[in-house]
């Protein structure tokens, strides 16, 4: 492991569309990839009238947008689908929204997907 980097070996997995996509609904996903590539966890969710609805969680491929992020935080201002990624085992268990453009209350979500 490179000093100062959190190695990602597994991530929380969730798929709200598991029946349609024919996948597991929940679990722990082992992350694989080329040896020279970094691996990340991610979360995607929607905010429906203030209610958080998780879309997917799992492993994410090498992506510079995720480098050295120990926390999963979406910074885009009011996207239709929120996305965050991070480095470190199971770092996508919790995810947050901190828009860069304006100062608002963060929606910090230690969400456990329901079966």
């Amino acid at each position: 492991a490179i000093l100062g980097r959190s190695e990602t070996q597994e991530c929380l997995f969730f798929n709200a569309n598991w029946e349609r996509d024919r996948t597991n609904q929940t679990g722990v996903e082992p992350c694989y990839g080329d040896k020279d590539k970094r691996r990340h966890c991610f979360a995607t969710w929607k905010n429906i009238s203030g209610s958080i609805e998780i879309v997917k969680q799992g492993c994410w491929l090498d992506d510079i947008n995720c480098y050295d992020r120990t926390d999963c935080i979406e910074k885009k201002d009011s996207p239709e689908v929120y996305f965050c990624c991070c480095e470190g085992n199971m770092c996508n268990e919790k995810f947050s929204y901190f828009p860069e453009m304006e100062v608002t209350q963060p929606t910090s979500n230690p969400v456990t997907p329901k079966p």
Partner: antibody, heavy 120, light 107 residues
């Protein structure tokens, strides 16, 4: 080096059957989801089917549902596509492709393809 | 199903030109957008994944951008080996769907 090698294509009459195989090497086959994607002559890419790392979950395009069956033998590092009740519109080059994650973020490696021709 | 619409369907360009291809999804797909390059008689090759990330061995003249529903593939300075057909693909949900392709031809 990741390698995917398809075989089993050929000429078949409408209503007939074929089984395609995809031999994988150069990676831990039983850790990855796998896909079949096809391309009709002169046309674009169409996803056909996928299967998760252990064969527990499968998915199909509506155009092949009920006629095609995807499977895998992890002990042989091989992916299969059983194609029944073939139609002229199934004529295409069939590619197997590796899914990068459980949720198929991207199809990161592809085979060279095998041609299936359905004609009387 | 999520529809992926690419434009233009074909374009003619010269070596050294800057080329831009666009892809629009029928609904938001967040960052689940990939680009592939295909040369005649060959298998597609992953070019860019997750909107902006270059696949292994892909030259830096290729770049991707966008989010939500609108995405762009840019070739900063077209090289002779770049004449090919390019496809976008969403993996936000099943079925995986591809754009119709953009054929980049020599002017």
């Amino acid at each position: 080096e990741v390698q995917l090698l398809e075989s089993g294509g050929g000429l078949v009459q409408p209503g007939g059957s074929l089984r395609l195989s995809c031999a994988a090497s150069g990676f831990t086959f039983d850790s990855y989801s796998m896909n079949w994607v096809r391309q009709a002559p002169g046309k674009g890419l169409e996803w056909v089917s996928n299967i998760n790392y252990n064969g527990g979950y499968t998915g199909y395009a509506d155009s092949v549902k009920g006629r095609f069956t995807i499977s895998r033998d992890n002990s042989k590092n091989t992916l299969y596509l059983q194609m029944n009740s073939l139609r002229a519109e199934d004529t295409a080059v069939y590619y197997c492709a590796r899914g990068a994650n459980w949720h198929d973020t991207a199809l990161d490696y592809w085979g060279q393809g095998t041609l299936v021709t359905v004609s009387s | 199903d999520i529809q992926m619409t690419q434009s233009p369907s074909s374009l003619s360009a010269s070596v050294g030109d800057r080329v831009t291809i666009t892809c629009r999804a029928s609904q938001s797909i967040s960052r689940y957008l990939n680009w592939y390059q295909q040369k005649p008689g060959k298998a597609p090759k992953l070019l860019i994944y997750a909107v902006t990330s270059l696949a292994s061995g892909v030259p830096s003249r290729f770049s991707g951008s966008g989010s939500g529903t609108d995405f762009t593939l840019t070739i900063s300075s077209l090289q002779p080996e770049d004449f090919a057909t390019y496809y976008c693909q969403q993996s936000y949900e099943s079925p995986l769907t591809f754009g119709g392709g953009t054929k980049v031809e020599i002017k």
